[in-house]
Interface confidence: low
């Protein structure tokens, strides 16, 4: 899915109001320095691509994130604010339902959610433009104007 045409400000608002808190709840009891961030992203569409992958694609050692509260709210936000996103996720959702057996918070899952926090953090602070403008605008965002 190409996240270029999402309404980034609305997704940001959803993250700030609820998703961020759900991520913190999931990570409660874990030191913020326990995991090193190894996944990064360079602009908002790229960040959403990485967020989508880490949140919904089962990985070795962590197959159980998709039904977590933060994941469901992420899915809802993407479905509402990214045109055509829902249609691309129907088959993937079926596969996830089959893959899910039980809710187990493994260390691998905690590490994955720590990476997600880093990706969301980058999504929420898009890079400054290289032209030296006094405007705070994502260097890759042509259609959405947003101040922080």
């Amino acid at each position: 899915y190409d996240f270029t045409n999402c309404d980034f400000e609305k997704i940001k608002a959803a993250y700030l109001s609820t998703i961020s808190k759900d991520l913190i709840t999931y990570m409660s009891g874990t030191k913020s320095t326990e995991f090193n961030n190894t996944v990064s992203c360079s602009n908002r569409p790229h960040c959403l691509t990485e967020i989508q992958s880490l949140t919904f694609n089962p990985t070795a050692g962590c197959a159980s994130l998709a039904k977590e509260m933060f994941a469901m709210k992420t899915k809802a936000a993407l479905a509402i604010w990214c045109p055509g996103y829902s249609e691309t996720q129907i088959n993937a959702t079926q596969a996830m339902k089959k893959a899910r057996k039980s809710k187990v918070t493994t260390n691998k899952c905690l590490e994955q959610v720590s990476q997600l926090q880093g990706l969301w953090r980058r999504f929420n602070r898009p890079l400054l433009k290289q032209q030296g403008s006094s405007d705070y605008k994502d260097d890759d965002d042509k259609h959405h104007h947003h101040h922080h």
Epitope: L16, S20, N37, S42, R121, R122, N124, R125, L127, L128, K129, Q130, G132, S134, Y136, D139, H147, H148
Partner: antibody, heavy 121, light 105 residues
Framework: EVQLVQSGAEVKKPGASVKVSCKAS????????MNWVRQAPGQRLEWMGI????????SYNQKFKGRVTLTVDKSASTAYMELSSLRSEDTAVYYC??????????????WGQGTTVTVSS | EIVLTQSPATLSLSPGERATLSCRAS?????MHWYQQKPGQAPRPWIY???NLASGVPARFSGSGSGTSYTLTISRLEPEDFAVYYC????????FGGGTKVEIK
């Protein structure tokens, strides 16, 4: 532990340029913005500009536009602030300050120790 | 450019008293940060995003406000609280207020 270590004091003549460095350690340099703030003797804090070490993107206080240049050396985790066409009123302590995204807001959470720049003929 | 105006410029109080510092923005901002500065030292982050105390800041400090009006309150002044406090916004280009000096009466 996050640390920002700035270069030493400078004495410059009017019309000259000064380049102040700020070496960052204890965090991933490209993950956060770097601000430059100055404070003239007995005066308020004055924001000069900001740079994203990730891509070199900058934004400046209009007051300094054309006179201040912010750069980074990613390999050395060091930010630089160069101020040209110095005048006596540029005499101040110059600070670098990391800007972190936390609590749903951008704040300057770590500051360098400050570099005193004196402009005098 | 958003202009931040702090009042009063100087607040003369005795230890144990309550201090109320005001910061007004020329247009609405999402949140306000506060910094404490003592003579010869770099500013220290004191309150993040309107109401979140920075690490190590005593609970007698609190922050509140929204829109164009923000407040830093010290419920009972201790000797170490006497300093200059600056508000700062980061909605657009960053900017600081003129500072409020809290001095011993």
């Amino acid at each position: 532990e996050v640390q920002l270590v700035q270069s030493g004091a400078e004495v410059k003549k009017p019309g000259a340029s000064v380049k102040v460095s700020c070496k960052a350690s204890g965090y991933t340099f490209t993950d956060d913005y770097m601000n430059w703030v100055r404070q003239a003797p007995g005066q308020r804090l004055e924001w000069m500009g900001i740079i994203s070490p990730y891509n070199g993107g900058t934004s400046y206080n209009q007051k300094f536009k054309g006179r201040v240049t912010l750069t980074v050396d990613k390999s050395a985790s060091t930010a630089y602030m160069e101020l040209s066409s110095l005048r006596s009123e540029d005499t101040a302590v110059y600070y670098c300050a990391r800007e972190d995204y936390d609590y749903d807001g951008y704040a300057m959470d770590y500051w360098g120790q400050g570099t005193t720049v004196t402009v005098s003929s | 450019e958003i202009v931040l105006t702090q009042s009063p410029a100087t607040l003369s109080l005795s230890p144990g008293e309550r201090a109320t510092l005001s910061c007004r923005a020329s247009s609405s901002v999402s949140y306000m940060h506060w910094y404490q500065q003592k003579p010869g030292q770099a500013p220290r982050p004191w309150i993040y995003a309107t109401s979140n105390l920075a690490s190590g800041v005593p609970a007698r400090f609190s922050g509140s406000g929204s829109g164009t009006s923000y407040t830093l309150t010290i419920s009972r002044l201790e000797p170490e609280d006497f300093a200059v406090y600056y508000c700062q916004q980061s909605d657009n280009v960053r900017g600081f207020g003129g500072g409020t000096k809290v001095e011993i009466k």
